[in-house]
Amino acid sequence: LNTTILTPNGNEDTTADFFLTTMPTDSLSVSTLPLPEVQCFVFNVEYMNCTWNSSSEPQPTNLTLHYWYKNSDNDKVQKCSHYLFSEEITSGCQLQKKEIHLYQTFVVQLQDPREPRRQATQMLKLQNLVIPWAPENLTLHKLSESQLELNWNNRFLNHCLEHLVQYRTDWDHSWTEQSVDYRHKFSLPSVDGQKRYTFRVRSRFNPLCGSAQHWSEWSHPIHWGSNTSKENPFLFALEA
């Protein structure tokens, strides 16, 4: 572990999504115990949850969280004002929209208030930690006798998202998937009118506004085609 102490106006830079530092200690004590890693996710740029595994502590400890933005106008150290709890022990912090600045380096510091030298600091690139809400309002319409077009909406700027469409018929064992760019539109060129199709979509904050790895939840599925499929064992599992 790197033992550089980060201050709000420090000049350290990193290209990683996070960078962990801990306080050095002179003697073996409770302060040598590593603090849990903080994981932050920004939900649709409406709020952010930064959480840690509170059960990893040897005894129940209300760890405290501070944060700031490195090399920016928002470099003043802030205390968490809205803790999340797990069995009455702090396990996270929720930040509201006005406290989220995507393209500045977010620095989060976890501390044991009973042992102030025991602290860990991470630097995060929030634009790589955005998780959008699931796509909504899926609609299907026929472009021709055998061609279907799937459209959907996102509660976010379209150009910041890419999408993954999955579809299958009631005869298929697995999903077929197709990547779709910010245009949020998918065409299926040949549809079998005798089969029932199911479509679903998820979205990701990538690659134009960030490099997030996490996908949204799947949308509610939408169906198209024959409702009857007597010999098919997959249909009911699909709808469950």
Epitope: Y103, Q127, L157, L208, S211
Partner: antibody, heavy 119, light 107 residues
Framework: EVQLVQSGAEVKKPGASVKVSCKAS????????MHWVRQAPGQGLEWMGH????????NYAEKFRSKATLTADTSTSTVYMELSSLRSEDTAVYYC????????????WGQGTTVTVSS | DIQMTQSPSSLSASVGDRVTITCRAS??????LNWYQQKPGKAPKLLIY???RLHSGVPSRFSGSGSGTDFTLTISSLQPEDFATYYC?????????FGQGTKLEIK
């Protein structure tokens, strides 16, 4: 201080290519988009495309899709725009301009590079 | 593509006047509307972003309003340095597009 410095004026013959550079300084290069905007003589502003410097993804307006190619060198904080198959209609001032993705405007602009296409 | 239509195309006014320039989008762009000022031979400068947020260093006499498809740039009291061409720009949908510009001249 944020600065975008573009390469100098170019005179090219029809059919040739030109590569315009835009060197950025004074900010974290990879947190931004770099846009390219064209302004023909006496005309308005026309958005050509942009590149996300945090990952290299690009997007173009349809009319520039086969005309312009955007690339970036993060080691030198420089963005390049190459224009191919030049025609007299490509004579214009070309600006690079940075913006944070999402809803921020283009808050810093290069000084502009004049490209003249003439036989 | 989203068309941005500015009006008027040109405008004559005097120092101290209150001036309004409008911009209409061909479809809903929410609040993703920016305004720029450009003087002859110079690069454009950002004035207003996200419909109404004043860019740092821009005088408070500039303000933006509107939403959806109709937007307004207002200069509350014209100063000599405000005579320039103004452009609106939508950042909602790729390809991003500019209005055709409004030239503000001295009366």
């Amino acid at each position: 201080e944020v600065q975008l410095v573009q390469s100098g004026a170019e005179v090219k013959k029809p059919g040739a290519s030109v590569k315009v550079s835009c060197k950025a300084s004074g900010y974290t290069f990879t947190s931004y988009w770099m846009h390219w905007v064209r302004q023909a003589p006496g005309q308005g502003l026309e958005w050509m495309g942009h590149i996300y410097l945090g990952g290299g993804a690009t997007n173009y307006a349809e009319k520039f899709r086969s005309k312009a190619t955007l690339t970036a060198d993060t080691s030198t904080s420089t963005v390049y725009m190459e224009l191919s198959s030049l025609r007299s209609e490509d004579t214009a001032v070309y600006y690079c301009a940075r913006s944070q993705p999402y809803y921020y405007g283009m808050d810093s602009w290069g000084q502009g590079t004049t490209v003249t296409v003439s036989s | 593509d989203i068309q941005m239509t500015q009006s008027p195309s040109s405008l004559s006014a005097s120092v101290g006047d209150r001036v309004t320039i409008t911009c209409r989008a061909s479809q809903d762009i929410s609040n993703y509307l920016n305004w720029y000022q450009q003087k002859p031979g110079k690069a454009p400068k950002l004035l207003i972003y996200y419909k109404s947020r004043l860019h740092s260093g821009v005088p408070s006499r500039f303000s933006g309003s509107g939403s959806g498809t109709d937007f307004t740039l207002t200069i509350s009291s014209l100063q000599p340095e405000d005579f320039a061409t103004y452009y609106c720009h939508q950042g909602h949908t790729i390809p991003f597009t500019f209005g055709q510009g409004t030239k503000l001249e001295i009366k």
